[in-house]
Interface confidence: medium
Amino acid sequence: MDSLGTAATQFLFDLFKELNKTNDGNVFFSPVGISTAIGMIILGTRGATASELQKVLYTEQGTESSRIKSEEEEIEKREEIHHQLQMLLTEISKFSNDYDLIISNRLFGEKTYLFLQKYIDYVEKYYHASLEPVDFVNAADESRKKINSWVESQTNVKVKDLFPEGSLNSSTKLVLINTVYFKGLWDREFKKEHTKEEDFWLNKNLSKPVQMMALCSSFNFTFLEDLQAKIVGIPYKNNDISMFVLLPNDIDGLEKIMDKMSPEKLVEWTSPGHLEQRRVDLRLPRLQVEETYDLEPVLEAVGIHSAFSEHADYSGMSARSGLHAQNFLHRSFLVVTEEGVEATAGTGVGLKVSSAASCELVHCNHPFLFFIRHRESDSILFFGKFSSP
């Protein structure tokens, strides 16, 4: 059987492709955040709903996946997913003096609705999430504000109003929240006096001004001949976390990269054996990206249907029938400056009853892909496409 990592990387790609289809501009999201939120949902689902969700986070090798599985195998697979996510969260959450990386999970439940103690015990065990009762029935907007203020507190006030006015109502029974907050300093700082205004080319004809940072230093680097692109790894202090930038040679070369990209290739390109230490003249724009997605249609496009239907089986979460995912909000925020990065993501799932990145020149003055990877856990914290300042 393959690990969570392979399926999660495939899932990342599927998500990215779907988000890219519907978003002309930038794309930015947290695969770890979304996977964690889905893990918390899997804990509470049973039957076909659970199987469907499990498939996006876990794959089998060979033909085994095509045969009908026994209930015991399904349970074993489910436990393996949660165990791996638990290990991932533990690894990621290890304290560091060099950066802040905080993943937070919380459940906000309608105070009169009854959630299974087993679900609450397990969600705390695997995801360090607690349940906070709120009054959706009589004070939905007050509850919404309470949830939003918790998200703000977990993301250093970078993610505000995750749930907009009117998005939660008296029929909301559970809001499942995952936030990922990262603030790091570059291992080799860009000097502010080297930052200059330059053109960033959206395509061959259109450009926008950006503040372009510059640094000539030793980085993990390689040419990707088949893709006509370069990849550079920019480490943060203590090298635990790096931002990788995948830059096409041509201004309009990003589409070709995305067509040829695969989860296996991504793993291969970023592996220590593939990259080599080179002197690189890196020109990287100061970035500020903020994206909000309703992931429901995106997840439906990658094969998750029943979790959002009124026939969803959430019987592992509650004894009450009719519980289903109402929406799946994901907001992510990224700032890249000379000192380093600040990145956050908030994922919220609202449940209602049928009734939440001489010298080699790497000049990032045209659309590129980037991702922030945690080395020890080999997980992608954030993934994005920067195509419009």
């Epitope: 609705y113 009854l114 103690q117 015990d121 607690s130 004894a319």
Partner: antibody
Framework: QMQLVQSGGGVVRPGGSLRLSCAAS????????MSWVRQAPGKGLEWVSG????????GYADSVKGRFTISRDNAKNSLYLQMNSLRAEDTALYYC?????????????????????????WGQGTLVTVSS | ETTLTQSPGTLSLSPGERATLSCRAS???????LAWYQQKPGQPPRLLIY???SRATGIPDRFSGSGSGTDFTLTISRLEPEDFAVYYC????????FGQGTKVELK
């Protein structure tokens, strides 16, 4: 279909012992906390004892504390009530009931079984008569 | 421990009539964690209402619950022949207590 089938009732002398069983089917037994509730002849309902989903936490009414022991075997989808030092006032129809589970942070943190719980499915009941 | 007092003790009504059953708590029922059960002779209780006003799965909409704090009401809008039974309220917020019951009998 969901079922709770009870057994083990009968007539016993004061000071005697009895073990009640409740076999569950039609639902994932180890997802749920379970309770025993009794009803004396012609009287109302009284919560007796409760156990959480994995058996790690139990609770008892003051009237049975030290005499009764609740347990479960998730592998067998079964709930038990071991009743020792029985008294005449223990005479009642005993029901096993599935708990809808917790609602409040307080009860969750305190792990007080039986508090913050209602009962959504009940067994058919088994009569326990304590008489000399 | 909370004491629940149900009234009246007995309610004599005809099919089609409206039944109003009261449950008063000696102290505030935290979070409106009050449930109503129906029990027919020789049968176990059946959950009707939880959270003071939410109908349990499969319960007809003629049954409704209301109230908060210390005063709660179960209303059966139009009595059906199968509704004649004993009704119990339960405080499941801060204690494990049940009321003594209200019998709804055929007039």
């Amino acid at each position: 279909q969901m079922q709770l089938v009870q057994s083990g009732g009968g007539v016993v002398r004061p000071g005697g012992s009895l073990r009640l069983s409740c076999a569950a089917s039609g639902f994932t037994f180890d997802d749920y906390g379970m309770s025993w509730v009794r009803q004396a002849p012609g009287k109302g309902l009284e919560w007796v004892s409760g156990i959480n989903w994995n058996g790690g936490s139990t609770g008892y009414a003051d009237s049975v504390k030290g005499r009764f022991t609740i347990s479960r075997d998730n592998a067998k989808n079964s709930l038990y009530l071991q009743m020792n030092s029985l008294r005449a006032e223990d005479t009642a129809l005993y029901y096993c009931a599935r708990e809808s589970s917790m609602t409040t942070v307080t009860t969750y943190l305190l792990r007080e079984v039986g508090v913050g719980l209602d009962f959504d499915y009940w067994g058919q009941g088994t009569l326990v008569t304590v008489s000399s | 421990e909370t004491t629940l007092t149900q009234s009246p003790g007995t309610l004599s009504l005809s099919p089609g009539e409206r039944a109003t059953l009261s449950c008063r708590a000696s102290q505030t029922v935290s979070g409106s964690y009050l449930a109503w059960y129906q029990q027919k002779p020789g049968q176990p209780p059946r959950l009707l209402i939880y959270g003071a006003s939410s109908r349990a799965t499969g319960i007809p909409d003629r049954f409704s619950g209301s109230g908060s704090g210390t005063d709660f009401t179960l209303t059966i809008s139009r009595l059906e022949p199968e509704d004649f039974a004993v009704y119990y309220c339960q405080d499941y917020g801060s204690s494990r207590t049940f009321g003594q019951g209200t019998k709804v009998e055929l007039k």
